[in-house]
């Protein structure tokens, strides 16, 4: 067991341009307070998961009123440390969220109003018992300077607060197998105190209060032999490789107590001991009030109407959850139309539109042909965010500016010669063939397989392809 301690040194405008406006004014005096949330491991620091290592709320700082015309200075801070007690081992790696809250002290109906000024988050490695670590974090135009440390509560010592120390019984040395407790050389490491009643033969512990069973034993105190009747192989419980020994359920399996309540079994059921701020038979009811600033991410706190709901958080856009602790994945609603890319910037949603579309949600199909003329009598065709020209005969290319060579595809059959003409192409057919593309043979007796040639054209004359 131990305590995580956080000391806020300053909160004010960060370096660089764009100094923030003071959060308080003569018309609206205010004061600051801080909230810290800790989670074990290098977990995501987004506020979705609960503060599993603990959370703390500072006292309110002194009332501050901005001097007209003056830039926002470092704001007056609450006295004292923020302390987050932890009951079990210190994890060594942790994630933190520190929120700076403003309490407005104007004449609001229903008492003071709270709003979130800044929120910083990070992941750190920290050994318990070490010196204060200093940190600077920026949130927008604000800068927060703070120090933190983790310290063990006696008799626990060590970087994880899992070793126990006791004063020496003899002046010269510690007992068998027990080392001196650095840095407290006048104390000795104490043997771990397992859970009361934990079987000395079949149980052991790696942390105080724990009772872990040796293979073949189960139950909360490791006093129950595991049945081997369901083993698939003949190996007995003494075998280190047996795959059939399933430890029995521990006390309060699946901890049914909500909100970090501690659970103890009763003969037929269980009982919950609730942490501060929660009550109810299963610790399911929050006893936190708006005075504790429970709404994250700028949520507005309103006193609950019924006694089982001491407060209600009205969340700003982009957040949800009973404490506005969950960021809404607004892009999952696919708000960007016409294939636009969705970007959730936290304070706003942005859509990056594909070519040919515009608008906040890419809902406007741009007039692809606006201002785009197709040359040489071509007509513009819209489609899919791009324009296309349908070109007049004899022209091609994106804008119909290129003259097409109608003979490039060798359209005249049976050796006919092709001539480009202003309105298309003309085939001069080889003897014995006729037709627009020289595709029809002329019969040997001079008659054509086609109807008679139009007046003014003899078989064998060049045929114009219109």
């Amino acid at each position: 067991a131990g305590v995580f301690e956080l000391q806020i040194h300053s909160f004010g405008p960060g370096p660089g341009p764009g100094a923030p406006r003071s959060p308080c004014s003569a018309r609206l005096p205010c004061r600051l307070f801080f909230r810290v949330c800790l989670k074990p491991g290098l977990s995501e620091e987004a506020a979705e998961s609960p503060c599993a290592l603990g959370a703390a709320l500072s006292a309110r700082g002194p009332v501050y009123t901005e001097q007209p015309g003056a830039p926002a200075p470092d704001l007056p801070l609450p006295d004292g440390l923020l302390q987050v007690p932890f009951r079990d081992a210190w994890p060594g790696t942790f994630s933190f969220i520190i929120e700076t809250w403003r309490e407005e002290l104007g004449d609001q109906i229903g008492g003071p109003a709270w709003s979130l000024l800044a929120r910083v988050a990070g992941r750190r490695r920290l050994a318990a018992g070490g010196p204060w670590a200093r940190d600077i974090q920026r949130a927008g135009a604000w800068e927060l300077r703070f120090s933190y440390r983790a310290r063990c509560e006696p008799p626990a010592v060590g970087t994880a607060c899992t070793r126990l120390c006791r004063p020496r019984s003899a002046p010269s040395r510690c007992g068998p197998g027990l080392r001196p407790c650095a840095p407290l050389e006048d104390e000795c490491e104490a043997p771990l105190v397992c859970r009361a009643g934990c079987s000395p033969e079949h149980g052991f512990c790696e942390q105080p209060g724990e009772c872990r069973c040796l293979e073949g034993w189960t139950g909360p105190l490791c006093t129950v032999p595991v049945s081997t009747s369901s083993c698939l192989s003949p190996r007995g419980p003494s075998s280190a490789t047996t795959g059939c020994l399933v430890p029995g359920p521990g006390p309060c399996d699946g901890n049914p107590c909500a909100n970090g309540g501690s659970c103890s079994e009763t003969p037929r059921s269980f009982e919950c001991t609730c942490p501060r701020g929660f009550y109810g038979l299963r610790c399911e009811v929050s006893g936190v009030t708006c005075a504790d600033g429970p709404c994250f991410n700028g949520g507005l706190c309103v006193g609950g109407a019924d006694p089982d709901s001491a407060y209600i958080c009205h969340c700003p856009p982009g957040f949800q959850g009973s404490n506005c602790e969950k960021r809404v994945d607004r892009c999952s609603l696919q708000p960007c139309r016409n294939g636009g890319l969705c970007l959730d910037l936290g304070h706003a949603l942005r859509c990056r539109c594909r070519a040919g579309f515009a608008g906040p949600r890419c809902e406007h199909d741009l007039d692809d042909c606006a201002g785009r003329a197709c040359a040489n009598g071509g007509t513009c065709v819209e489609g899919g965010g791009a324009h296309r020209c349908s070109c007049a005969l004899g022209f091609g290319g994106r804008d119909c500016r290129e003259r097409a060579d109608p003979c490039a595809a060798r359209p005249c059959a049976h050796g006919g010669r092709c001539y480009a003409h202003f309105s298309g192409l003309v085939c001069a057919c080889a003897p014995g063939y006729m037709g627009a593309r020289c595709e029809f043979p002329v019969h040997p007796d001079g008659a054509s397989a086609l109807p008679a040639a139009p007046p003014g054209l003899r078989p064998g004359d060049p045929q114009r392809y219109l």
Partner: antibody
């Protein structure tokens, strides 16, 4: 052996408040959990809520806004109030004793009918 | 809230039969499950708690097993007094009952 005797209920009109009381004989009403459970005709049992000796309650979320369970340890009694009743509240109501969420001794049951 | 589903809804059996009733929870309830027996016009009677612990005074032919989301009540040799409706109940989070399984004479 603990015995539970319950009374109240009967025929109610819609929007009225149902009141039931359960007396505990042969045991104390401290150190236990006291529950109310109901069973609409031909349907499954439904947990209404429970209270412990210190007065901490837990209610079925679907009924929470209308339910009040209280305990009077001096009289060895506990009671149920259900406001704004409708025909859907017609059921046999049982009081019970036990541990958290579990009932090992039951009252005889009281039929409550809601009809205009 | 947690939904409890029993199967079968009705079971026809004879005296001496081995009978098994299944109860499924919509989410894990660890082993916080009880079984009750109810006869027409009577209050339910607790048989099993913590999924497998036999309530005092209940015959040993009744047994319970399971954890998490799947549970069973077994009557090893059905007796004339056992024809009744059986309910499972979770008490991990508030309390909810299954719809009941009626064991009737075949």
């Amino acid at each position: 052996q603990v015995q539970l005797q319950q009374w109240g209920g009967g025929l109610l009109k819609p929007s009225e408040t149902l009141s039931l009381t359960c007396a505990v004989y042969g045991g104390s009403s401290s150190g236990n959990y006291w529950s109310w459970i109901r069973q609409p005709p031909g349907k499954r049992l439904e947990w209404i809520g429970e209270i412990n000796h210190s007065g901490t309650t837990s209610y079925n979320p679907s009924l929470k806004s209308r339910v009040t369970i209280s305990v009077d340890t001096s009289k060895n009694q506990f009671s149920l109030k259900l406001s704004s009743v409708t025909a859907a509240d017609t059921a046999v109501y049982y009081c019970a004793r036990g541990e958290l969420g579990i009932a090992d001794s039951w009252g005889q049951g009281t039929l409550v009918t809601v009809s205009s | 809230d947690i939904q409890m589903t029993q199967s079968p809804s009705t079971l026809s059996a004879s005296v001496g039969d081995r009978v098994t009733i299944t109860c499924r929870a919509s989410q894990s309830i660890s082993r916080w499950l009880a079984w009750y027996q109810q006869k027409p016009g009577k209050a339910p009677k607790l048989l099993i708690y913590k999924a497998s612990s036999l309530e005092s005074g209940v015959p040993s032919r009744f047994s319970g097993s399971g954890s998490g989301t799947e549970f069973t009540l077994t009557i090893s040799s059905l007796q004339p007094d056992d024809f009744a409706t059986y309910y499972c109940q979770q008490y991990n989070s508030y309390s909810t009952f299954g719809q009941g399984t009626k064991v009737e004479i075949k």
